[in-house]
């Protein structure tokens, strides 16, 4: 009686279980009653990452420099190329098909987490006691200057965008 299901790494064709091709190889001929499945390795810039019965290998992803992409990991016959973004840019999606410029944190905000090739800058508002007076993708919130440690007094209070202004103590 012909099989209705096959073992792992096999496929059913013409009422027969044939071996799948190993990762990195494509199918050129199905098995028959007398012959095994025939496979062939994928060519350069091609891959198949699973046990398969594909008659064509997939093309490696192209990391288009015009989209800000570069190769992070070169593909093999069993793996796709992994793209990442050029310095100062990050991927717009998990598939990393294009890049956008890292966001800068506005004055009053500091960098909580510096951007990577796959994630954008994370900003946080500067809490009381801290400030940021620049728009930056790298600068954290800086603590206000401590006037006391310089034997000075606060002449102008700090904000989330400005440092305190220190001045000499009034002499009586």
């Amino acid at each position: 009686e012909p099989p209705t299901a096959c073992r792992e790494k096999q496929y059913l064709i013409n009422s027969q279980c044939c071996s799948l091709c190993q990762p990195g190889q494509k199918l050129v001929s199905d098995c028959t009653e007398f012959t095994e499945t025939e496979c062939l390795p994928c060519g350069e810039s091609e891959f198949l990452d699973t046990w398969n019965r594909e008659t064509h290998c997939h093309q490696h992803k192209y990391c288009d420099p015009n989209l800000g992409l570069r190769v992070q990991q070169k593909g093999t016959s069993e793996t796709d190329t992994i793209c990442t973004c050029e310095e100062g840019w990050h991927c717009t999606s998990e598939a990393c098909e294009s890049c956008v410029l890292h966001r800068s944190c506005s004055p009053g905000f500091g960098v909580k987490q510096i951007a990577t090739g796959v994630s954008d800058t994370i900003c946080e508002p500067c809490p009381v006691g801290f400030f940021s007076n620049v728009s930056s993708a790298f600068e954290k919130c800086h603590p206000w200057t401590s006037c006391e440690t310089k034997d000075l007094v606060v002449q102008q209070a700090g904000t989330n965008k400005t440092d305190v202004v220190c001045g000499p103590q009034d002499r009586l």
């Epitope: 190993q22 990195g24 001929s29 012959t35 025939e38 496979c39 390795p41 060519g43 350069e44």
Partner: antibody, heavy 121, light 113 residues
Framework: QVQLQESGPGLVKPSETLSLTCTVS????????LHWIRQPPGKGLEWIGV???????DYNPSLKSRVTISKDTSKNQVSLKLSSVTAADTAVYYC???????????????WGQGTLVTVSS | DIVMTQSPDSLAVSLGERATINCKSS????????????LAWYQQKPGQPPKLLIY???TRESGVPDRFSGSGSGTDFTLTISSLQAEDVAVYYC?????????FGQGTKLEIK
């Protein structure tokens, strides 16, 4: 025993189509694929293409637009057609049996004696 | 396409001596999943078709004398004839059977010194 025999005209005019037949015995074309290879006089070997036992074909990209390989299993024959020939296509044309060794490994284990085709007006 | 380059183009060796032919591929012929190298060697005597000697770099075809051996990995391969016999005079071709289009080296002519 395994035998392969190429046949066809020895002289073809430029711009015409070269047509060759490979007749095999001692094995079945449903069990083994068949390659065509050529060798210009005094030069090296160039792979033209293959018809796999399942009937799929693969061609050399340098010839793909001009080449067709087909088979008639009942007659144990494989044909090669190469269109728009020029003097550069003058060569000994061989057919060779494909052998599959598992793990995606293929080689040409039996060859015909070859037939010389000259392209000239 | 994978380009195959053989060296030397011709070689003269004394009877009984060792003959070595080299073959280089433009890309690796090592399949990372199964760790096999897809390289074959053929022998062509004058007026005859090529004859398969070796496949998968080092596996001798049935009936091939054991004085013929193959080695190498990745992009660099060698055919060695351990003790040259008169009947070994021929042109030797390496061929990658990694993927289509299958490609051959330009050939190495082996003669007796």
């Amino acid at each position: 025993q395994v035998q392969l025999q190429e046949s066809g005209p020895g002289l073809v005019k430029p711009s015409e189509t070269l047509s060759l037949t490979c007749t095999v015995s001692g094995f079945s074309l449903t069990t083994y694929g068949l390659h065509w290879i050529r060798q210009p006089p005094g030069k090296g070997l160039e792979w033209i293409g293959v018809i796999w036992r399942g009937g799929n074909t693969d061609y050399n990209p340098s010839l793909k637009s001009r080449v067709t390989i087909s088979k008639d299993t009942s007659k144990n024959q494989v044909s090669l057609k190469l269109s728009s020939v020029t003097a550069a296509d003058t060569a000994v044309y061989y057919c060779a049996k494909n052998s599959y060794y598992g793990d995606g490994g293929h080689a040409m284990d039996y060859w015909g004696q070859g037939t010389l085709v000259t392209v000239s007006s | 396409d994978i380009v195959m380059t053989q060296s030397p183009d011709s070689l003269a060796v004394s009877l009984g001596e060792r003959a070595t032919i080299n073959c280089k591929s433009s890309q690796s012929l090592l399949h990372s999943f199964n760790q096999k190298n897809y390289l074959a060697w053929y022998q062509q005597k004058p007026g005859q078709p090529p004859k398969l000697l070796i496949y998968f770099t080092s596996t001798r075809e049935s009936g091939v004398p054991d004085r013929f051996s193959g080695s190498g990995s990745g992009t660099d391969f060698t055919l060695t004839i351990s003790s040259l016999q008169a009947e070994d005079v021929a042109v030797y071709y390496c061929q990658q059977h990694y993927t289509t289009p299958f490609t051959f080296g330009q050939g190495t002519k082996l003669e007796i010194k």
